[in-house]
Interface confidence: medium
């Protein structure tokens, strides 16, 4: 068990031409926050696939408002580290996705609006307990500088956080046969007493230098399945007459995989591909049941009705798959109404509403004209999620506050002359034309 820690140092325009001045518009203040997603191994998976090692969301950073004309300052960042706890062993190789989000804090109806500014991804090797690693990543015109590390939570230590150390209350309190953990001098650990190379999966030891094998395994290092061990005499009879294997067998000779499993050799040993309903190193364990805890992410396990289905996982909201292992793309259900933009932030679902709509799912159609006065005798017209004013003659603009020049648009056709009048405009038509706009 341990914690992956991410420290964001800076986020801003990268070098080179075309870089944006600021993530915030000059009109609206905004603030930044970050999301990190971790996956074991060197996966090339999409960002939407589950963050199997964990994910974290930063706090919101300080509010920033761009000052037009002023030099672009360093963007204020959220305080503190992003921390992703991991319960199992640290995998050593991992993939990360870091997203930079912008929260606009203007006077939008329906609250703040979120948008994804940049997403960077990478694959790294990292030992737990090591120093901070620094990194720079670019996404489009943006540049992100950050550091990261993995550290173990006591009593776990080691590069994978799998060695267990016992805290000691005073110097020299390590028990017999125990020595201080390096480099943590205030903890004790049992020395590795098994014979060098003894398989940790199939062997164990109680005395220094020994390697005792679990059932089904043999050899000095417990790496040879019992069913593939060769005859005692290297020149012994063939397996056809005695059932004894000829010397120097491959690890798959005699097929150590039970229950119809197929065997394939690996550099160290062998690997069984088990048929449905069997698992274990040699497919020796049958029928995964609820006792095996097959349902992830809080899924409820119920025994299946037929032998082919030994269990059924009832998944909590947000997860799917036979073992509740897949996160549902909640935005695919189109929960935001009235054209709202859906954002799945991992811990919560957010809808960014179009103007004129509000509510958690943009379900409320606001009265576009509420509190919107049209000046100078104009009348408010609602529609399309926004309001507009139908202005009295002689006035124009969004709120009818501007005195209009009725002749500015050259309304008189065919060379007619336009005259402004208190009630509107009058066209004096050229010879041969007539009508209010000289259109005939």
């Amino acid at each position: 068990a341990g914690v992956f820690e991410l420290q964001i140092h800076s986020f801003g325009p990268g070098p080179g031409p075309g870089a944006p001045r600021s993530p915030c518009s000059a009109r609206l203040p905004c603030r930044l926050f970050f999301r990190v997603c971790l996956k074991p191994g060197l996966s090339e998976e999409a960002a939407e696939s589950p963050c199997a090692l964990g994910a974290a969301l930063s706090a919101r950073g300080p509010v920033y408002t761009e000052q037009p004309g002023a030099p672009a300052p360093d963007l204020p960042l959220p305080d503190g580290l992003l921390q992703v706890p991991f319960r199992d062993a640290w995998p050593g190789t991992f993939s990360f996705i870091i997203e930079t989000w912008r929260e606009e804090l203007g006077d939008q109806i329906g609250g703040p609006a979120w948008s994804l500014l940049a997403r960077v991804a990478g694959r790294r090797r990292l030992a737990a307990g090591g120093p901070w690693a620094r990194d720079i990543q670019r996404a489009g015109a943006w540049e992100l500088r950050f550091s990261y590390r993995a550290r173990c939570e006591p009593p776990a230590v080691g590069t994978a956080c799998t060695r267990l150390c016992r805290p000691r209350s005073a110097p020299s309190r390590c028990g017999p046969g125990l020595r201080p953990c390096a480099p943590l001098e205030d903890e004790c650990e049992a020395p590795l007493v098994c014979r060098a190379g003894c398989s940790p999966e199939h062997g164990f030891c109680e005395q220094p230098g020994e390697c005792r094998c679990l059932e089904g395994w043999t050899g000095p290092l417990c790496t040879v399945p019992v069913s593939t061990s060769s005859c005692l005499s290297p020149r012994g009879p063939s397996s056809a007459t005695t059932g004894c294997l000829v010397p120097g067998p491959g690890p798959c000779d005699g097929n150590p995989c039970a229950n119809g499993g197929s065997c394939s050799e690996t550099p160290r040993s062998f690997e069984c591909t088990c048929p449905r309903g069997f698992y274990g190193l040699r497919c020796e364990v049958s029928g995964v049941t609820c006792a095996d805890g097959p349902c992830f992410n809080g899924g409820l396990c119920v025994g299946g009705a037929d032998p082919d289905s030994a269990y059924i996982c009832h998944c909590p909201p947000g997860f799917q798959g036979s073992n509740c292992e897949k996160r549902v793309d909640r935005c695919s259900l189109q929960p935001c109404r009235n054209g709202g933009l859906c954002l799945d932030l991992g811990h919560a679902l957010r809808c960014r509403c179009r103007a004129g709509f509000a509510g958690p799912r943009c379900e409320h159609d606001l009265d576009d004209c509420a509190g919107r006065a049209c000046a100078n005798g104009g009348t408010c017209v609602e529609g399309g999620g926004a309001h507009r004013c139908s202005c009295a003659l002689g006035f124009g603009g969004r709120d009818c506050r501007e005195r209009a020049d009725p002749c500015a648009a050259r309304p008189c056709a065919h060379g007619g002359r336009c005259y402004a009048h208190f009630s509107g405009l009058v066209c004096a038509c050229a010879p041969g034309y007539m009508g209010a706009r000289c259109e005939f």
Partner: nanobody
């Protein structure tokens, strides 16, 4: 500090049953390989059974078909159900734990005595 506490031992007649429990504290139980060993007077300590983190078990030939080892992650406890007990099963039974990336069982309980009379 990792602590293993065994219980359930006792005196039983041949053919009878006992259920040993081993409760772990101080570490995430799901991440531990659990095992039961036994040691009869004057004999070497012997692996009885082991249950991996995935839940699959292995057994010594002498107890196969009679003993069942299971784990209850919710209660951080491993159970050894012993049926059809024989006098030769008489021994001190020890619960042990380790991670699956290391060889040695680093964590041990104090042991519980099982005596089978004929």
């Amino acid at each position: 500090q990792v602590k293993l506490v065994e219980s359930g031992g006792g005196l039983v007649q041949a053919g009878g049953s006992l259920r040993l429990s081993c409760t772990v504290s101080g570490f995430t139980f799901d991440d531990l390989v659990m095992a039961w060993f036994r040691q009869a007077p004057g004999k070497e300590r012997q692996l009885v059974s082991l249950v991996a983190t995935a839940g699959n078990s292995v057994y010594a030939d002498s107890v196969k078909g009679r003993f069942t080892l299971s784990r209850d992650n919710a209660h951080s406890t491993a159970y050894l159900q012993m049926n059809g007990l024989k006098p030769e099963d008489t021994a001190m039974y020890y619960c042990a734990a380790r991670t699956d990336s290391e060889h040695a069982f680093k964590f041990w309980g104090q042991g519980t005595q099982v005596t089978v009379s004929s």
